[in-house]
Interface confidence: low
């Protein structure tokens, strides 16, 4: 009786026993067995199928024949079958097991095919707990990761298989515990167009960060109040609060404060002057009588009621610069002229603060003639 | 070592349909999958398809999804590509190509020629 | 899918030189690149694969290299018996795609 069966296969391989022995038609029963534990019996000569192979099954076979009750007359010879390992059990590396949090880490899935196999083609799929990574299995025995956070800490492992699914082997899991970092110096600035904060545009409150990891709470306070105007929560260094159109009654002392789940750290306190632009100013004549005449001294007076100082007005004779003057402080400013009869037409003014400029209306003035006789001065302003 | 032996070639009339065989030798033939590519005259190679010999699962390049059906035979070690509703468009030379991904090992290729 | 352009249809060099022959992938597929050698009425040959792996028995006169998009092969000392089309592939994502082709002349 002679068992035929090959002597050195690997995992996944098929592997089939044949039992040989003359005069088939006189076996009532035949047996495979393997380190002396009866695998099967069957009724007549048949193969023994082992459909995918798996260390355990390296052992001792033989095959026996009985026809008789309990007794096995013929016993086969014994074949050694030795089932190779087709690759390791991968070994899961990473990059870092403690990264830093918003920073990449490459994952590996590390595995060695037999040196009688190396055409065998494997593929990989990476975990998190008992997530997926990435898009899944794949080729490569490698994966990046672009970014981690602090939820992405916890246990990993891999998986490697044949691409038929024959094979299939998980690595050990290993612990990534991903690292936040404090936040660091909070700073608030001021972003505004022009680098000025201007009554009607638009202001931007800009929270940073020098340092700190993951999701940051960035909050906005006006210290007269100690009330919070916003609240942002992201991944960034920074956050901005938009005010659409700054009001006057916005001017005064701000901060914010940066919090990512450790000690909330608070900005320095930033003052905010709004600046206004001037409005439309009004031009004043002024003159000793109630009507001007050729040598009269007239005085030109405009003002603009709103406006941050310093205020320049300058005073216009139809479309000739007469002269200029400033308001330091604010309020209105004054100029002189002594009459001929070549002053007479429209007189206007300009307020300008750096915000933008404002002309007055036109005041038409009639000076009288030498033959004495005075005409109306009127005044106008708006 | 490793073969793909493919069938001869074929001609065929337009609307017809066509069944081309390619028998593995040499290696173990459920344990690597069988690509189909697709060769016209004077241009690139297009891959077609592939199929997983050990389950018969398919994947297919959607362009070839209504032209082409993938099977196996494991008694006998053969993958088989059958084109369907043929026009003289499909007039190529078709190779079978072992692997998942790269394929390291290709048939002869089976020239097709489809003409009234 | 992904468009694998060889912008050298045509490359022409001598024995002994050294000639590079390149593919740009229309998006990144890593280093999922394959190279194949055809010689005029044979079936496709794989060089290299990943993209740097010769494969069984290819020379290493043969070389590549690249990731992303980029890719290239590099024959260093051409032989005569290197006359032939050379195919780079994608195998980064369904379907998988090959390149025009650059056809190598032999002066």
């Known amino acids: 009786l002679t068992l035929v069966a090959p002597s050195s296969v690997f995992e996944g391989d098929s592997i089939v026993l044949k039992c040989q022995g003359e005069q088939n038609w006189k076996i009532q029963k035949m047996a495979y067995h393997k380190d002396n534990k009866e695998l099967s019996v069957f009724k007549k000569f048949s193969d023994f199928l082992i459909q995918s192979a798996v260390l355990s099954d390296s052992g001792n076979y033989f095959c026996s024949t009985k026809g008789q009750l309990f007794l096995w007359d013929k016993t086969s010879n014994i074949v050694k079958i030795k089932v190779q390992e087709l690759f390791q059990r991968p070994v899961l590396t990473a990059s870092s097991f403690q990264p830093i949090e918003g920073g990449p880490v490459s994952l590996k899935c590390e595995t060695r095919l037999s040196p009688q196999r190396l055409d065998v083609q494997l593929q990989f799929c990476f975990f998190r707990e008992n997530q997926v990574l990435g898009s899944g299995w794949s080729s490569s025995p490698e994966l990046q990761i672009s970014a981690v956070w602090s939820e992405d800490t916890g246990s990993y492992w891999c998986k490697a298989e044949t691409v038929t699914h024959r094979i299939r082997k998980q690595s050990l899991q290993s612990q990534i515990h991903v690292q936040r970092i404090p936040i660091s110096n909070v700073s608030l600035e001021i972003r505004a167009p022009g680098g000025q904060v201007t009554e009607g545009q638009k202001l931007i409150l800009l929270c940073s960060v020098a340092g700190g990891t993951g999701n940051v709470t960035f909050s906005w306070y006006r210290e007269a109040t100690g009330t919070s105007m916003g609240k942002k929560t992201q991944r960034s260094l920074s956050a901005e609060l938009e005010i659409p159109a700054v009001k006057e009654s916005d001017a005064g002392k701000y901060y914010c404060r940066a919090d990512n789940g450790h000690v909330p750290i608070q900005s320095k306190v930033v003052n905010i002057p709004v600046r206004i632009p001037v409005s439309r100013p009004v031009l004043t004549l002024r003159s000793p009588g109630a009507q001007a005449a050729v040598g009269d001294l007239l005085e030109l007076h405009c003002e603009a009621l709103r406006g941050s100082p310093p205020i320049l007005y300058q005073f216009y004779h139809e479309d000739v610069t007469l002269g200029n003057s400033s308001a330091p402080s604010g309020g209105g400013a004054s100029f002189n002229l002594s009459l001929t009869a070549e002053h007479s037409g429209n007189y206007s003014c300009e307020a300008n603060n750096g915000l933008g400029a404002q002309c007055s209306e036109a005041v038409p003035v009639s000076i009288s003639g030498p033959d004495g006789y005075r005409r109306d001065l009127m005044t106008a302003g708006v | 070592q490793v073969q793909l032996q493919q069938s001869g070639p074929e001609l065929v009339k337009p609307g017809a349909s066509v069944k081309i065989s390619c028998k593995a030798s040499g290696f173990s033939f459920t344990a690597y999958f069988m690509n189909w590519v697709k060769q016209s005259h004077g241009k690139s190679p297009e891959w077609i398809g592939r199929?997983?010999?050990?389950?018969?699962?398919?994947f297919f390049n959607q362009n070839f999804k209504d032209k082409a059906t993938l099977t196996v035979d494991k008694s006998s070690n053969t993958a088989h590509m059958e084109l369907l509703s043929l026009t003289s468009d499909d007039s190529a030379v078709y190779y079978c190509?072992?692997?998942?991904?790269?394929?390291?090992?290709w048939g002869q290729g089976t020239t097709l020629t489809v003409s009234s | 899918d992904i468009v694998m352009t060889q912008s050298h249809k045509f490359m022409s060099t001598s024995v002994g030189d050294r000639v590079s022959i390149t593919c740009k992938a229309s998006q990144d597929v890593g280093t999922a690149v394959a190279w194949y050698q055809q010689k005029p009425g044979q079936s496709p040959k794989l060089l290299i694969f990943?993209?740097?792996t010769r494969h069984t028995g290819v020379p290493d006169r043969f070389t590549g290299s690249g990731s992303g998009t980029d890719f290239t092969l590099t024959i260093g000392n051409v032989q005569s018996e290197d006359l032939a089309d050379y195919f780079c592939q994608q195998f980064s994502s369904l379907p998988h795609t090959f390149g025009g082709g650059t056809k190598l002349e032999i002066k």
């Open positions: 990943w993209p740097s």
């Open positions: 199929i997983n010999p050990y389950n018969g699962e398919t």
């Open positions: 190509g072992r692997g998942l991904y790269y394929l390291n090992y």
